[in-house]
């Protein structure tokens, strides 16, 4: 399987909410001994590999933000902890999973990574990640709503 990032760049005004999205693609093993672990974290475009370093998102670690479930189940993170920090990560039945960040500030700008681990008990873990950039802007040059740039091209879309 692979992880797709529909948008590689999100440009948002300060105070706006944004939902960063990843999508699981390809064949997904639905055996009873296969489970999935999904999470989000901040990172940097490291020399060795993008997304290798795991930094907190608004003080919440990737452990705090993880989703755990079998292949077909939907899941959400611990509501209380995440929502206290204006965050919510969620996953649906169709391979989409996302993190929503509320009331963006300039400090939220940076590289965000989604991580999917396919756990094949008795065999191995298979991990795949996706990366996307969030730019939070302020002042007269900031957009009125979030503008997202698809990963495949630089055509932008506005999210209201």
């Amino acid at each position: 399987f692979k992880v797709a990032t529909p948008y590689s760049l999100y440009v948002c005004p300060e105070g706006q909410n944004v939902t960063l999205t990843c999508r699981l693609l390809g064949p997904v093993d639905k055996g009873h001994d296969v489970t999935f672990y999904k999470t989000w974290y901040r990172s940097s475009r490291g020399e060795v590999q993008t997304c290798s370093e795991r930094r907190p998102i608004r003080q919440l670690t990737f452990q705090d933000l993880h989703l755990h479930h079998g292949g077909h189940q939907a899941a959400q993170t611990s509501h209380d902890l995440a929502q206290r920090h204006g965050l919510e990560s969620a996953s649906d039945h169709h391979g989409n999973f996302s993190i929503t960040m509320r009331n963006l500030t300039l400090l939220d700008s940076g590289l965000y990574c989604c991580l999917v681990v396919e756990i094949r008990h008795h065999h191995s873990e298979h991990r795949v990640h996706g990366a996307m950039e969030l730019q939070v802007q302020t002042g007269k040059d900031a957009p009125s709503n979030c503008v997202v740039y698809p990963s495949s091209s630089q055509d932008s879309e506005q999210i209201t």
């Epitope: 001994d33 489970t35 590999q49 290798s52 993880h66 008990h121 873990e125 991990r127």
Partner: antibody
Framework: QVQLQESGPGLVKPSETLSLTCTVS????????WSWIRKPPGKGLEWIGY???????NYNPSLKSRVTISVDTSKSQFSLKLSSVTAADTAVYYC???????????WGQGTMVTVSS | EIVLTQSPATLSLSPGERATLSCRAS??????LAWYQQKPGQAPRLLIY???NRATGIPARFSGSGSGTDFTLTISSLEPEDFAVYYC?????????FGGGTKVEIK
Amino acid sequence: QVQLQESGPGLVKPSETLSLTCTVSGGSISSYYWSWIRKPPGKGLEWIGYIYYSGSTNYNPSLKSRVTISVDTSKSQFSLKLSSVTAADTAVYYCARDIPAFALDIWGQGTMVTVSS
Amino acid sequence: EIVLTQSPATLSLSPGERATLSCRASQSVSYYLAWYQQKPGQAPRLLIYDAFNRATGIPARFSGSGSGTDFTLTISSLEPEDFAVYYCQQRINWPLTFGGGTKVEIK
């Protein structure tokens, strides 16, 4: 902050079953792998196996025929049973939290188990 | 199973000196390697994950490097509390395996 605490008898007779319990406090047991590792005197660390929160287990092939790991989520505990023990099973036994695609990040303080008649 | 070989078995150094510990895998583990520190009577403590990332709260004097089969843990300037046994551990597949350990002792 999540903490782990091992408990169980410190002395087990040869051919009997070693039974240890790990109690998880300060966090949920309903995620991650929950592992057992041991360190025999003068030797290195050996991974025994884990139970995933969902109930799936995975054991070291070298011990698989003798090991059972179980979980009781209502008590926030997971347990190790090692049957037909010999002196070679004398070790400090640790329980630990293992996060997928990460590491064994939180460990109990360990409990010494001696196999002797 | 993947065998991890650590060298040297013992490293005798003085505080302030640089420590370089090696871990070699019998087959590639990509960068899925962790380092732990263990002091007498204590549980192991996670230092490095994914070969080169410091775990939370680990001082900057600890650094990891390498990928594939050869890995290094470096302690840039030894503090008195750094004298301990260090283990590497792979997680590219199960069973999880550890190296035999390197003891860093005071010279």
